[in-house]
């Protein structure tokens, strides 16, 4: 593997801008407590995804197969981008800084049309599946704003389990307590470049 590290300005302020700028008008469904999966996203954001150590998340996707890599990109190589769709959870958040008006933000992550990252809690794996809306709960992740302009993605279906990096691949990683939320292998950077 070739290691050509070059540094981009990581776009973290944009997330806060999104949180502050959005005036959210909620559907009756949210008040009634129905699943958020049928509700339109409050905003969408196209960004490249990289690890705390600036390795890129890349996708090799065919009709019937895929690979998700965590790797150093070559200097001239364009970064893969994912479409992050933001949803506000109807459940109040106890944590500060993660959402708007004390509510949690959830995201879905899509590298291309009709495909989304899914949590497979049984296999502790992160998978790419072709899905139709409404998306299953396995495609939703609670977004946490962390230190150092990083974010982390917690499974909606399995609180305390996060998307992380294991052996140069994405995997689901159990985090025991909030003290360990800053563990580097679950921290990701979002960048417009």
């Amino acid at each position: 593997m070739h290691h050509h590290h070059h540094h981009h300005h990581h776009h973290a302020a944009g997330l806060n801008d999104i949180f502050e700028a959005q005036k959210i008008e909620w559907h009756e469904a949210a008040i009634e407590g129905r699943s958020i999966t049928g509700i339109s996203p409050i905003t969408e954001y196209l960004a490249s995804l990289s690890t705390y150590n600036d390795q890129s998340i890349t996708f090799a996707l065919e009709d019937e197969s895929y690979e998700i890599y965590v790797e150093d990109l070559k200097k001239d190589e364009k970064k893969d981008k994912v479409l992050l769709s933001y949803y506000e959870s109807q459940h109040p958040s106890n944590e500060s800084g993660d959402g708007v008006d004390g509510k949690m933000l959830m995201v879905t992550l899509s590298p291309t049309k009709d495909f989304w990252l899914h949590a497979n809690n049984k296999e502790h794996s992160v998978e790419l599946h072709k899905s139709e809306k409404p998306l299953p709960d396995q495609a939703f992740f609670v977004l946490h704003n962390m230190h150092s302009n990083c974010v982390s993605f917690e499974c909606k279906t399995d609180p305390g389990v996060f998307i992380g990096v294991k052996d140069n691949h994405l995997a689901l990683i159990k985090v025991d307590s909030s003290e360990n939320l800053s563990t580097e292998n679950i921290l990701f950077k979002l960048s417009e470049t």
Epitope: F59, A60, E62, D76, E77, T112, F115
Partner: antibody
Framework: EVQLLESGGGLVQPGGSLRLSCAAS????????MSWVRQAPGKGLEWVSA????????YYADSVKGRFTISRDNSKNTLYLQMNSLRAEDTAVYYC????????WGGGLRYPFGYWGQGTMVTVSS | LPVLTQPPSVSVSPGQKASITCSGE??????AAWYQQKPGQSPILVIY???KRPSGIPERFSGSNSGNTATLTISGTQDMDEADYYC?????????FGGGTKVTVL
Amino acid sequence: EVQLLESGGGLVQPGGSLRLSCAASGFTFSSYAMSWVRQAPGKGLEWVSAISGSGGSTYYADSVKGRFTISRDNSKNTLYLQMNSLRAEDTAVYYCARDLWIQLWGGGLRYPFGYWGQGTMVTVSS
Amino acid sequence: LPVLTQPPSVSVSPGQKASITCSGERMGDKYAAWYQQKPGQSPILVIYQDTKRPSGIPERFSGSNSGNTATLTISGTQDMDEADYYCQVWDSSTGVFGGGTKVTVL
């Protein structure tokens, strides 16, 4: 099984026009960027043009810019190359080629050619 | 656009190693692909992203890329490997091929 079948080649006079087609099957056509690559008799491969999966972005080699137009009809799973103002140096076998992987949101051209058609011969001569 | 330079021909005895180079400015900063083409046939992808083999391509094919040179290596060359080989990169959404190398198995 991925299959690409070119057609439309033939003999044409300099200054004339020709339209090549590439019928695709065995995959989700609209998900993949497609290219045309040509090979003059006894010569090497030359990339000619490419188009994104949606058809919204097109790309051309300098040697054909302004003369050739790439397009696609995703409802018919067909790729096209409209060739105008043909020159003797355009004489070649024309291959259509599919990207190895599905095009992502990032766009651009960066994947290798994973699948190739059998080619169609274009001869420009008076 | 980069000019990719390949040796016109390489000769190798059966069972021996054949190395084909592809030289271009800052080649190592890009991902190189290699294609095999036999007479009267369409090209076949044998190496992509410098080092990766598509399914169905024998392990004797390998690649590397650093500095200004990408290299395709065929270890234990067989008669069936006699063909033309082309390197290829993308540069600013333009496809660029090398001139091709004819590999002859003696």
